[in-house]
Structures are given as structure tokens and as C-alpha cells.
């Protein structure tokens, strides 16, 4: 995308960032817990092999920054970055950023409520040092460390409700939703890729709405 | 495997001070916050105070306040607490607690009997 | 005032259900942990945060929350569970931390 321009193409999109292809399509060989992508993914298969190990080239962002994250909860930050590297369904929520490693980010994208609360159940007793996973760390070793006297403590003091984890850990990159999965109103993280891709729908019907919302806005600037 | 070791049994005068160390090992020590409680002889715990393991910030009981010091090294993984003017309602079993999450206390030293007697 | 209230001394029978509690204002606002203490051991983490379990910790231990007050249920009480337990608060004001009085339980049987 032109940097000094908003998305026009919402639909079947990859985002302008450090890993992504610029053209969604097939990739057969997609790894684990991305393989739900295979059909038409934004990631490739190294990179998918790449996000599911500790510490992987891709960030070099250590989940184990307070002793050893439980593996009920990484599968959810493995699931998390999956849908960030492959989805072509986030579209409606891409928006610019003026940063040295990518020029585009998602932002409140919706995501099911269901999706969220497991997430959040899942790992609300592994530890952290921080609410915010996008800035503040120490990375003087290249690896992300806990910035001096940031405490590790439980993900439920750092992160109370499922709303302060999901929203609040990528810097809005998530809101939650009320819908539930499968209502076609909300992204799910996870899926069974032998029914399709629910998110193609989700992202069809934000998009259509944006459409609307935008033609009527430009049809109030005119009057005004 | 986290453990938490403390210093041997002290006796003491009245009027003395102690000074109770507590080793931790198997994870990263200035990471977590140290809290030390004491339990006099068959009574209820007792919080005396924490320090932040990492920036060495301390919080201490009002109760103690002026009468504890707790401090720590952290190229020793060990932290400290020292507690003056002693008298005889400070014997008690002084123990050093890991924090995980405001006031959860998931490891405990074993417990150091500090005896003020004259 | 920055209290944690405990009754004193809870008996039950082998194998029915006991309800240990803790009142105080700070429980508004924060969780309650609850420990498990054996004569001449350090006390033992069962309960912490919303309703959280330590690895190792059987699940006939559960927490509840309720306004001002905090309950540890042990559903099932073993003869092993018989201790003292303590309650613990964070006090929001200066980030202290606050004791109950503990609770003596006896299991009968």
C-alpha cells in the first residue's frame, strides 16, 4: 500500500509489515497450529515453522520472561501470531503506522468473546512483568527482558479481566467483541479449516459496513 | 525448582539487632518481590514488609516502620532483614516469602527462630 | 481499617464440606489468598487471586468472593487437611499486605 494513502481493498489483503507476502494465496506446508491458513495464507511456511519456537528469529521475542510461560497459554500466543503473519481477513482494521519494522498494524480488530475469555483463563496464572507487550522492554541483549524493577507477577495482576489482556497487550490491536464464534461478526483466532475460513465472512460484512459508513460521510462532507 | 534458604536460629539481647538472610535460587531472582512475615510462638503471621528484587524499592509494615531494614544483594541472590531495638515480643519465626501477585506468597524459606532474651 | 477477620476454630466431619472465612474492607477491591499451615512448617499456598490453585494443590480447595468477605471451601475434608489457615489481603494504600487471625480447622473422624 502507498504510505500516504488509507486502503481502498479491504477484502483478501496482506498487511504492509516485516514478514508478510504482499499477496495472499495458497501455502500447503504451513506449520501446526497455522496450518488452518493453508488455503489462502499471508504467511510462509518458514515463517509459520519460525513462530511456534521460544524466542523464534522472527521478533526475538521470549514468551519466557518470567520463568517458563505454560504450554495451555503459548498455544495462544503462537495462535495470536498466526493470525497477525497469515490471516488475509484483517483488511477492515489494517491501518498505518509510521514504524521502523512495518508500515501497517492492525487495530481493534474484533475478536470473539470466547476467543478472548480462553485466552485470558488459559494464562492468567503464568507471569509477566508488563501489561503492555509493544513497548518498554529492556532489549539491550536482543532478546526482550523485564525493564528494571517491573516485577513479574501473575497475568491476572497485570491483566484482571480478559478485556485488559486481549485489548490492552498488543496496544489495541484487538477489542473484544460481543458476538459470539461463529456468529459471523467476530474473528476467531481459532478455527476448524475443514468448514472455510470464518473470517472471510466477518471481514465481507465490516468491510460492506465501512463502504456504507463512508459513502455516507462523504455524503455529509459535501453538504457541509 | 525454586527455593528459598534462611540463615540459621539466632538468640539475642534485648536492645540488639538481627540480621536474617534468605538465598533464593532456581529462578531469576531480581524479578520478583521479596515480602518478609513473622509468627510469634503460637500466634497468627505477621507482615513485616517487601523489597522490589530488581530496583531494591522497599515497603514496610507502620508497625515496623523505623525498626526493620530489608535489603538485598543481588549478585548473591539474597535478600535481608534486619530488625533493631530488639525485645523479648520479637522472638518469633521470621520468614521470607516470593510475591506473585500483590500479597500471593507461592514460596517460603523454612524459617529462621530469632530468640531475644536476657 | 485494614483488618482481615477469621473465626478462631472450624471443625468438620471426614469427608463433608467446610467453609472458612475472611472479612475486611480490603476485600472490596482485592483478592484473597489463603495458606495452609502445619505446626512447625512454613505456611503453604492453596488459594490465590479470582480462584487460582497452585500446581500440587488437591482440587477439594476452592476460593469464593463475595463484597467484604473471602471463602476457602474444602469439599471433602481429608484428615490431612486439618491445619491452621491464614487469609491474606493486599491493602490497596501503599501496596501493604495484611494477615487474618487464621483458623484452627479440626477434622473429625
Known amino acids: 500500500a502507498d504510505p500516504g494513502q488509507d486502503r481502498t481493498d479491504l477484502l483478501n489483503v496482506c498487511m504492509d509489515a516485516k514478514h508478510h507476502k504482499t499477496k495472499p494465496g495458497p501455502e500447503d506446508k504451513l506449520h501446526d497450529q497455522c496450518s488452518p491458513w493453508k488455503k489462502n495464507a499471508c504467511c510462509t511456511a518458514s515463517t509459520s515453522q519460525e513462530l511456534h519456537k521460544d524466542t523464534s528469529r522472527l521478533y526475538n521475542f521470549n514468551w519466557d520472561h518470567c520463568g517458563k510461560m505454560e504450554p495451555a497459554c503459548k498455544r495462544h500466543f503462537i495462535q495470536d501470531t498466526c493470525l497477525y503473519e497469515c490471516s488475509p481477513n484483517l483488511g477492515p482494521w489494517i491501518q498505518q503506522v509510521n514504524q521502523s519494522w512495518r508500515k501497517e498494524r492492525f487495530l481493534d480488530v474484533p475478536l470473539c468473546k470466547e476467543d478472548c475469555q480462553r485466552w485470558w483463563e488459559d494464562c492468567h496464572t503464568s507471569h509477566t512483568c508488563k501489561s503492555n507487550w509493544h513497548r518498554g522492554w529492556d532489549w539491550t541483549s536482543g532478546v526482550n527482558k523485564c525493564p528494571a524493577g517491573a516485577l513479574c507477577r501473575t497475568f491476572e495482576s497485570y491483566f484482571p479481566t480478559p478485556a485488559a489482556l486481549c485489548e490492552g497487550l498488543w496496544s489495541h490491536s484487538y477489542k473484544v467483541s460481543n458476538y459470539s464464534r461463529g456468529s459471523g461478526r467476530c474473528i476467531q483466532m481459532w478455527f476448524d479449516s475443514a468448514q472455510g475460513n470464518p473470517n472471510e465472512e466477518v471481514a465481507r460484512f465490516y468491510a460492506a459496513a465501512m463502504h456504507v459508513n463512508a459513502g455516507e460521510m462523504l455524503h455529509h462532507h459535501h453538504h457541509h | 525448582e525454586v527455593q528459598l534458604v534462611q540463615s540459621g536460629a539466632e538468640v539475642k539481647k534485648p536492645g540488639a539487632s538481627v540480621k536474617v538472610s534468605c538465598k533464593a535460587s532456581?529462578?531469576?531472582?531480581?524479578?520478583?518481590?521479596m515480602h518478609w512475615v513473622r509468627q510469634a510462638p503460637g500466634q497468627r503471621l505477621e507482615w513485616m514488609g517487601w523489597?522490589?528484587?530488581?530496583?531494591?524499592?522497599?515497603k514496610y509494615s507502620q508497625k515496623f516502620q523505623g525498626r526493620v531494614t530489608i535489603t538485598r544483594d543481588t549478585s548473591a541472590s539474597t535478600a535481608y532483614m534486619e530488625l533493631s531495638s530488639l525485645r523479648s515480643e520479637d522472638t518469633a519465626v521470621y520468614y521470607c516469602a516470593r510475591d506473585i501477585s500483590y500479597g500471593s506468597f507461592d514460596y517460603w524459606g523454612q524459617g529462621t527462630l530469632v530468640t531475644v532474651s536476657s | 481499617s485494614s483488618e482481615l477477620t477469621q473465626d478462631p476454630a472450624v471443625s468438620v466431619a471426614l469427608g463433608q464440606t467446610v467453609r472458612i472465612t475472611c472479612q475486611g474492607d480490603?476485600?472490596?477491591?482485592?483478592?484473597a489468598n489463603w495458606y495452609q499451615q502445619k505446626p512447625g512448617q512454613a505456611p503453604v499456598l492453596v488459594i490465590y487471586g479470582q480462584n487460582n490453585r497452585p500446581s500440587g494443590i488437591p482440587d477439594r480447595f476452592s476460593g469464593s468472593s463475595s463484597g467484604n468477605t473471602a471463602s476457602l471451601t474444602i469439599t471433602g475434608a481429608q484428615a490431612a487437611d486439618e491445619a491452621d489457615y491464614y487469609c491474606?489481603?493486599?491493602?490497596?494504600?501503599?501496596?501493604?499486605?495484611?494477615f487474618g487471625g487464621g483458623t484452627k480447622l479440626t477434622v473429625l473422624g
Open positions: 480490603s476485600l472490596r477491591s482485592n483478592y
Open positions: 523489597i522490589n528484587a530488581g530496583n531494591g524499592n522497599t
Open positions: 532456581g529462578y531469576t531472582f531480581t524479578s520478583y518481590a
Open positions: 491474606d489481603s493486599r491493602v490497596s494504600t501503599g501496596n501493604h499486605v495484611v
